[in-house]
């Protein structure tokens, strides 16, 4: 009951709080349980006790073990245990489950991700935030005090978020990272059979031979974040990648927008240097979700150049 798991990475700072609470005036003694050896309070030590806090500055794998804290008052003693595990830094991007803090959920209206354990440290803004090891960039992400705010949250925002900050102790700086999963829950959303807004079914698009042309497939799937929604193009019933015409490419990455609260996606098909044979192809805009698939077909026709003599 009065035992707490704590973990950290080697060469980072780790600060652990005694699981037994007491008034600030109470003294707290810390011991390494395996040897019953007292933890020093002198700050010159790499591992030292500071009241209710046990500080590893920085932590080493060999520090792993169970630490005992005894909160002493004039009338009673309370004992707690801190089970500390220090892990080697991972060479790859994957953050293993044992380094994860509790998962948090967010929605369109509330998307705060708090940096775990940060209140134990002496840190100064700004926090750095990473998602799946990539630094977060863009106006949708705002590092605010000890948490991250994500604007216009969508399903794709789910993932593992890591905060990184610097702990300062007597002028010395130590790095700290902490990772937690973020899940996105739908608020009063709904899903419907895909509705393709563009192109219109059996639309004829005029193009000029030798010029570039863009076709946009745009569809809406319901309100709020959608678990499964995709738009893509096919040529003559074949995947773009399998069709084997390098001049015709699907734009990588689907743009998501919220139109009147509806979740919509679009995908651009780029045709470089339009050729006569492109006019013979059937271009299918496909929209897919959990309900099923909708298809709108487009064909190209030659745009007659303006006769400047008339």
């Amino acid at each position: 009951k009065f035992s707490k798991q704590s973990w950290g990475l080697e060469n980072e700072a780790l600060i652990v709080r005694c699981p037994r609470q007491g008034k600030p005036s109470y003294t707290v003694d810390w011991y390494y349980s395996q040897t019953n050896k007292s933890i020093p309070t002198q700050e010159r030590n790499r591992v030292f006790a500071s009241g209710q806090l046990l500080k590893f500055l920085p932590a080493a794998v060999a520090d792993s073990g169970i630490y005992t804290c005894i909160v002493r008052s004039p009338t009673f003693n309370r004992t707690g245990y801190a089970n500390v595990t220090i892990y080697k830094k991972q060479s790859d991007c994957n953050v293993p489950d044992y380094l994860m803090y509790s998962t948090v959920s967010g929605s369109e209206k509330n998307s705060k991700i708090y940096c775990p354990t940060i209140d134990l440290y002496n840190w100064t803004a700004p926090l750095e935030w990473f998602k799946n090891c990539q630094a977060l960039q863009g106006s949708r992400y705002r590092a605010h005090k000890s948490f991250l705010v994500i604007d216009n949250v969508m399903t794709e925002d789910a993932g593992d978020y890591t905060c990184k900050f610097i702990h300062n102790e007597n002028g010395a700086n130590y790095s700290v990272t902490a990772t937690r999963s973020f899940t996105v829950k739908d608020e009063q959303g709904f899903s419907l059979f895909p509705v393709i807004g563009a192109p219109a079914q059996n639309e004829i698009k005029e193009v000029e031979i030798g010029k570039n042309a863009n076709l946009t497939c745009s569809a809406c799937f319901g309100k709020g974040t959608q678990f499964l929604a995709a738009v893509l193009w096919q040529l003559n019933g074949t995947k773009i990648t399998d069709f084997g015409e390098p001049r015709i490419q699907q734009e990588e990455g689907q743009n998501q927008s919220f139109s009147n609260g509806l979740a919509c996606l679009d995908m651009v098909l780029r045709i470089a240097d339009v050729k006569e044979e492109d006019l013979l192809l059937q271009y299918d805009c496909l929209a897919l979700n959990l309900h099923g698939l909708r298809r709108h077909t487009v064909r190209l026709s030659r745009k007659n150049p303006i006769d400047h003599h008339s």
């Epitope: 995709a230 893509l232 019933g237 990648t241 099923g292 698939l293």
Partner: nanobody, 121 residues
């Protein structure tokens, strides 16, 4: 219409692995996406994993990092590799596919009969 037949289900201990297969026949060239859904007793059917256009994959949060969906187009088969299985993964697993001829403007998912996965010690 696409016909789907699942295989590979069974009883496995927690922490164990299973590989489900889904063989598609019929109008297979028209398949745009294949997915695995599951339904536990007394619960709604939920999407576990989907592969779109043979390359884009999507997973339910509860299985991320443990399950992997893949497809072999030459065999018209989809697979679900399930590792680190938990008792809560116990369910009937259904394979589903969606596509349709180029003349069809709208089509729903086609379903297999399902295969039972039981995770228990």
């Amino acid at each position: 219409e696409v016909q789907l037949v699942e295989s590979g289900g069974g009883l496995v201990q927690p922490g164990g692995s299973l590989r489900l297969s889904c063989a598609a026949s019929g109008r297979t060239p028209s398949i745009i996406a294949m997915g695995w859904f599951r339904q536990a007793p007394g619960k709604e059917r939920e999407l576990v994993a989907v592969i779109i256009d043979s390359r884009t994959t999507k997973y339910a949060d509860s299985v991320k990092g443990r399950f992997t969906i893949s497809a072999d187009n030459s065999k018209n088969t989809a697979y679900l590799q399930m590792n680190s299985l938990k008792p809560e993964d116990t369910a009937v697993y259904y394979c589903a596919a969606v596509g349709g001829a180029t003349t069809v403007t709208a089509s729903e998912w086609d379903w297999g009969q399902g295969t039972l996965v039981t995770v228990s010690s």
